[in-house]
């Protein structure tokens, strides 16, 4: 079975790599525009130059193309704690990231928020903080992990998951209460 191709892909596949089929004349293959430029006018005929123009400030194309417009540069989302790692150029989009000692949490494929790396107070670092993952902490005895922080077992209620980890402490507290009521 032949995979389904979109109209643009069908048209491009007729021409050799680096060229595209003229939209008005399918016997002509025009040279694609270099990255950093966009298509202003198709080539007038075989072997003639495509009219490519450089992207204006605030826009870019990152690969060879026959786009009629450059793509708008992304803006880093301050409200998500993002900072600009490198600014947009005609051939590369803005690169956004997080500050030192922060990691990215992706809420969706194209949306991330910066959060502070956990310090593992009352625990030890099992895995260091990475670009896209928080520190993994292991808690000391008498503490359990809640929202990636080591919390005292005295804050563990019986209904919570922590009861397994804090069972000896909970039993101790119960035992002390029992002995006080005799």
């Amino acid at each position: 079975l032949v995979p389904h191709l979109g109209d643009r892909e069908k048209r491009d596949s007729v021409c050799p790599q680096g060229k595209y089929i003229h939209p008005q004349n399918n016997s002509i293959c025009c040279t694609k525009c270099h990255k950093g430029t966009y298509l202003y006018n198709d080539c007038p005929g075989p072997g003639q130059d495509t009219d490519c123009r450089e992207c204006e400030s605030g826009s870019f194309t990152a690969s060879e193309n026959h786009l009629r417009h450059c793509l708008s540069c992304s803006k880093c989302r301050k409200e998500m704690g993002q900072v600009e790692i490198s600014s947009c150029t005609v051939d590369r989009d803005t690169v956004c990231g997080c500050r030192k000692n922060q990691y990215r949490h992706y809420w969706s494929e194209n949306l991330f928020q910066c959060f502070n790396c956990s310090l593992c107070l009352n625990g030890t670092v099992h895995l260091s903080c990475q670009e896209k993952q928080n520190t993994v902490c292991t808690c000391h005895a008498g503490f359990f992990l809640r929202e990636n922080e080591c919390v005292s077992c005295s804050n563990c209620k019986k209904s919570l998951e922590c009861t397994k980890l804090c069972l000896p402490q909970i039993e101790n507290v119960k035992g002390t209460e029992d002995s006080g009521t005799t």
Partner: nanobody
Amino acid sequence: EVQLLESGGGLVQPGGSLRLSCAASGFTFKNKTMVWVRQAPGKGLEWVSHIDQEGEGTYYADSVKGRFTISRDNSKNTLYLQMNSLRAEDTAVYYCALLPKRGPWFDYRGQGTLVTVSS
């Protein structure tokens, strides 16, 4: 005490519209980025849209772009989500929430309002 109360959900036919509201209290609304998230039956939470303090910076998930509009009225401490051209896949409980600060979980979100898109 932070309180977020959503309203405006209901049953609507495909292609129809709804406007969700979220009344906020217990914090300085005008200083906070606000978020709409949703949870479809048997699925996890999905980030739908957010809006910054001034209402200038907005974000939309690809699945709702061009159909949903987020807005806010800081004088009324209210967040809105205008939903047009609704589809069956938009069926979910919609929650308004404060942008998380400490980590990737929602410390403050409302009880939700159910949106059902069906003919």
